[in-house]
C-alpha cells in the first residue's frame, strides 16, 4: 500500500497491515547456571530468566527449557551476548613438538532447531582465542543478525564452556529476537 | 488487523497502525569529551554529536545534555559502540603474595534513568579486561538490545575511563536507539 | 494515524504505511575471498553468497558485484560481523629505537558509496590491535548501526586484511540491511 | 620516525604576536588532538591549547582571549598564534601530541621565546 | 580552576633508594592524574596516565597510585638517570594543570 491509496471504501481489501505493538518479541537475561549433562561434542545450552528485571516475552513468544519457540513465520533479527570470564590462559607456555600449541578458546552459538529437520542449524557463531597472561580476564562476544523463520522453531545459545560465563548481571549477558 | 480485512467504510476503527517512519530514532557519533567532574563510583557520561555528519535525531527522538529523551513509549531496539585506546597495560609484570593482579579493564554501560526511579537502570554492560604488552593498544566494545522504555526515560552511555574512549572518528564510537 | 480514527471512507488517505514483509531486506553470508587487486591505501571488500544456506536478499534488494544496493530510501539497520584467523603476532618483540612497534591489528569498515558523491563514506568501523604471543589466534569483529539511506546508495565491507578472514562457515562471518 | 618540530621567532617585541609552528611527521595527524604548552623558565608548565584535524579547538580561558590555535592538514602542521605579548608570556613553548586523551605523550624539543624590547 | 600541589618541592636521595613524591589536587579529580619527568633542556616525558597506567617504555620501578585527591609516585630503586624534575597533571576538569614540579636530586 505503499505510496498509493486505500482502495474505495466499497473495495474490501485483504492487507498485511499490523500493529507493530503486537509482533512477538523477547529479551531474556542470564541465571546462574546449573550444570547438566550435553551431549558429546555438543555445546551446552544456556537457560535464562525470562520475566524478572528486564527479561520480558510478549506477544507469543514463549520462552520454555532453554529454547525461545517463535510464534509466527518471518524474518526476525536476532542476538545475544554472553560475557565470559576466567583464570590466567597461559596459553604461550606449553608448546608441543616446536609448534604453538592449540590456544584456549570461548565460543557462542544462536541455533536453530526445527523439529522436522534432523540437525539444529547454527545461525551465529562468535568466537575468540583467549590467550592472557598473568592476571583472570573477562570480556564479552555478542552476536546479531536478521533470519527468515518459521512458526515453530526453537533458538538457543550455545556455548563452549559454561563454567566461564559470568551470570551476575543481567546487563551482562542476555538473548533476544523480534519479529522485523 | 494481521489478516483479516478493513473493517467496513461504515465502521469507524481506532488503529495503533503508524507509518514507520514517523517512529523515534536517532543516531549519535562521538565529539571530542571534554574532562568533567562525575560522581565518585560513578561511570562518567559520554557527550555526543546528533546532528553533523551521519548523526541525526528525528520524531520527537530528542538529545539534550547527555541524554536521549525517550518521547513514546514502547519497545526500542538500543546500541552503542565505544572504541577505547590505550597505552601498555603490562598487567602481567605485578603479583601481589603469588597471586596474579586485578587486571586493567574497559567497561561501557548504556543506562536508563527513569526521574519517578532513585537510581538508573544498567540495561547493557560490556565489560573487558586489558592485558596488552609492548604496545600501544585499541578495541571496540559492541552492544546492542531490545528494551520496553517508558515516555520521559532518558538513555546515556557511560563508561569506565573517559579519558581512553578513541573520539577520532564518527564510525568508530557512536549510540543509537529506535523505535521497534 | 497513530491513536486516531481512519478517515471516513469518502475521503481517500495517501497513507505511508505499508506491510513490513514487503520491506528491502538481505542477510549476506561469507564466501571464500578470490584475491584480488584493490586501490593503495584503500582496504579490500569482501564478496558474499546472497542465495544459499542462510543467505537471502528479498524486496528489490539486491546484491551485485561486492555490493548490496539500496532500492528505497530510508531509514536501515545495517551490520557485519567478520571472523579473523592467524598465526602469532608477536607485536611486542621487535622495537625499534626503544619504542614498541606499531601493534598488528584488524580492521572492519561498512562503507557506503553514492554514485554522486565522489568519496565513500565510512558508516561503521571496528578496529582492534593483535598482540597474541604464542599461538593461532581468532576474534570477530561486529558492527550495527542505523543510517539514512537513499536509493541507489551502494553498501560494502571492507577489511584490513582479506587473507585474515574465516571464511569457513557461514555463522562466523556475515552481512546484513533491512528497512526499518 | 615520529617527530614533532616547533619553529618560529624566539624574539618577539611586547604587544606584537607571538607566531609559532609544529610540523608533525611519522604519525597519523587525523588520529589525534594536538597542543601547545609552555614553560617559563625555572617554573612549571602551563597547558595553552589543542586542536584537531577538522579544526576543532579548546583553549586555557586564562589565555583564551589571546590565543589562536589553527591547523594545515594539507602539510600535517598546527600553529600557535599569542597576540599582545608582555614579559610575561617569555617561555619555551612545547607542541605535544595530546594521548591517551588529555595527557601529552609526545613532545617537540620546544622552542625559547623571548619577550623583550 | 583545579590546583596541583607537589611535595615536597626537592627531594635528596641516593641511587638504590625509594623516591616517593606526591600530589595533591585542590578537588577530586578521579584517576584522572598524570606524571611527567623532565631533564634540564629536554622536553617532559609521560611515566603515568590514569593515577597507575605506566606509559609505553616506562621501566616497571615507576608507578603511580591514588584517586580522588592525593596522589603518589614511586621510583622502587633511583638509577642515576631518574634523578630530574617530576610534574604531576590532573585531566579532571578543564582546564588542563600541572604541579610546580618536584626536584629529585642526588644525596
Known amino acids: 500500500l505503499k505510496g498509493q491509496e486505500f482502495a474505495p471504501s466499497h473495495q474490501q481489501v485483504y492487507a498485511p497491515l499490523r500493529a507493530d505493538g503486537d509482533k512477538p518479541r523477547a529479551h531474556l537475561t542470564v541465571v546462574r547456571q546449573t550444570p547438566t549433562q550435553h551431549f558429546k561434542n555438543q555445546f551446552p545450552a544456556l537457560h535464562w530468566e525470562h520475566e524478572l528485571g528486564l527479561a520480558f516475552t510478549k506477544n507469543r513468544m514463549n520462552y520454555t527449557n532453554k529454547f525461545l519457540l517463535i510464534p509466527e513465520s518471518g524474518d526476525y533479527f536476532i542476538y545475544s551476548q554472553v560475557t565470559f570470564r576466567g583464570m590466567t590462559s597461559e596459553c604461550s607456555e606449553i608448546r608441543q613438538a616446536g609448534r604453538p600449541n592449540k590456544p584456549d578458546s570461548i565460543t557462542v552459538v544462536i541455533t536453530k532447531v526445527t523439529d522436522s529437520y534432523p540437525e539444529p542449524t547454527q545461525l551465529l557463531m562468535g568466537t575468540k582465542s583467549v590467550c592472557e597472561v598473568g592476571s583472570n580476564w573477562f570480556q564479552p562476544i555478542y552476536l546479531g543478525a536478521m533470519f527468515s523463520l518459521q512458526e515453530g522453531d526453537k533458538l538457543m545459545v550455545n556455548v563452549s564452556d559454561i563454567s566461564l560465563v559470568d551470570y551476575t548481571k543481567e546487563d551482562k549477558t542476555f538473548f533476544g529476537a523480534f519479529l522485523l | 488487523l494481521k489478516g483479516q480485512e478493513f473493517a467496513p467504510s461504515h465502521q469507524q476503527v481506532y488503529a495503533p497502525l503508524r507509518a514507520d517512519g514517523d517512529k523515534p530514532r536517532a543516531h549519535l557519533t562521538v565529539v571530542r569529551q571534554t574532562p568533567t567532574q562525575h560522581f565518585k563510583n560513578q561511570f562518567p557520561a559520554l557527550h555526543w554529536e546528533h546532528e553533523l555528519g551521519l548523526a541525526f535525531t528525528k520524531n520527537r527522538m530528542n538529545y539534550t545534555n547527555k541524554f536521549l529523551l525517550i518521547p513514546e513509549s514502547g519497545d526500542y531496539f538500543i546500541y552503542s559502540q565505544v572504541t577505547f585506546r590505550g597505552m601498555t597495560s603490562e598487567c602481567s609484570e605485578i603479583r601481589q603474595a603469588g597471586r596474579p593482579n586485578k587486571p586493567d579493564s574497559i567497561t561501557v554501560v548504556i543506562t536508563k534513568v527513569t526521574d519517578s526511579y532513585p537510581e538508573p537502570t544498567q540495561l547493557l554492560m560490556g565489560t573487558k579486561s586489558v592485558c596488552e604488552v609492548g604496545s600501544n593498544w585499541f578495541q571496540p566494545i559492541y552492544l546492542g538490545a531490545m528494551f520496553s522504555l517508558q515516555e520521559g526515560d532518558k538513555l546515556m552511555v557511560n563508561v569506565s575511563d573517559i579519558s581512553l574512549v578513541d573520539y577520532t572518528k564518527e564510525d568508530k564510537t557512536f549510540f543509537g536507539a529506535f523505535l521497534l | 494515524l497513530k491513536g486516531q480514527e481512519f478517515a471516513p471512507s469518502h475521503q481517500q488517505v495517501y497513507a505511508p504505511l505499508r506491510a513490513d514483509g514487503d520491506k528491502p531486506r538481505a542477510h549476506l553470508t561469507v564466501v571464500r575471498q578470490t584475491p584480488t587487486q584493490h586501490f593503495k591505501n584503500q582496504f579490500p571488500a569482501l564478496h558474499w553468497e546472497h542465495e544459499l544456506g542462510l543467505a537471502f536478499t528479498k524486496n528489490r534488494m539486491n546484491y551485485t558485484n561486492k555490493f548490496l544496493l539500496i532500492p528505497e530510501s530510508g531509514d536501515y539497520f545495517i551490520y557485519s560481523q567478520v571472523t579473523f584467523r592467524g598465526m602469532t603476532s608477536e607485536c611486542s618483540e621487535i622495537r625499534q629505537a626503544g619504542r614498541p612497534n606499531k601493534p598488528d591489528s584488524i580492521t572492519v569498515v561498512i562503507t557506503k558509496v553514492t554514485d554522486s558523491y565522489p568519496e565513500p563514506t565510512q558508516l561503521l568501523m571496528g578496529t582492534k590491535s593483535v598482540c597474541e604471543v604464542g599461538s593461532n589466534w581468532f576474534q570477530p569483529i561486529y558492527l550495527g548501526a542505523m543510517f539514512s539511506l537513499q536509493e541507489g546508495d551502494k553498501l560494502m565491507v571492507n577489511v584490513s586484511d582479506i587473507s585474515l578472514v574465516d571464511y569457513t562457515k557461514e555463522d562466523k562471518t556475515f552481512f546484513g540491511a533491512f528497512l526499518l | 620516525e615520529l617527530q614533532l618540530q616547533e619553529s618560529g621567532p624566539g624574539l618577539v617585541k611586547p604587544s606584537e604576536t607571538l607566531s609559532l609552528t609544529c610540523a608533525v611527521s611519522g604519525i597519523s595527524f587525523n588520529d589525534f588532538h594536538w597542543a601547545w604548552i609552555r614553560q617559563p623558565p625555572g617554573k612549571g608548565l602551563e597547558w595553552i591549547g589543542d586542536?584537531?584535524?577538522?579544526?576543532?579547538?579548546s583553549y586555557n580561558p586564562s589565555l583564551k582571549s589571546r590565543v589562536t590555535v589553527s591547523v594545515d592538514t594539507s602539510k600535517n602542521q598546527f600553529s600557535l598564534k599569542l597576540s599582545s605579548v608582555t614579559a610575561a608570556d617569555t617561555a619555551v613553548y612545547y607542541c605535544?601530541?595530546?594521548?591517551?586523551?588529555?595527557?601529552?605523550?609526545?613532545w617537540g624539543q620546544g622552542t625559547l621565546v623571548t619577550v623583550s624590547s | 580552576d583545579i590546583q596541583m600541589t607537589q611535595s615536597p618541592a626537592t627531594l635528596s636521595l641516593s641511587p638504590g633508594e625509594r623516591a616517593t613524591l606526591s600530589c595533591r589536587a585542590s578537588?577530586?579529580?578521579?584517576?584522572?592524574l598524570a606524571w611527567y619527568q623532565q631533564k634540564p633542556g629536554q622536553a617532559p616525558r609521560l611515566l603515568i596516565y590514569?593515577?597507575?597506567r605506566r606509559a609505553t617504555g616506562i621501566p616497571a620501578r615507576f608507578s603511580g597510585s591514588g584517586s580522588g585527591t592525593d596522589f603518589t609516585l614511586t621510583i622502587s630503586s633511583l638509577q642515576s638517570e631518574d634523578f630530574a624534575v617530576y610534574y604531576c597533571q590532573q585531566y579532571g576538569d578543564t582546564p588542563l594543570t600541572f604541579g610546580q614540579g618536584t626536584k629529585v636530586e642526588i644525596k
Open positions: 578537588q577530586s579529580v578521579s584517576t584522572y
Open positions: 605535544a601530541r595530546d594521548y591517551p586523551n588529555f595527557t601529552f605523550d609526545l
Open positions: 590514569g593515577a597507575s
Open positions: 586542536i584537531n584535524h577538522r579544526g576543532h579547538t
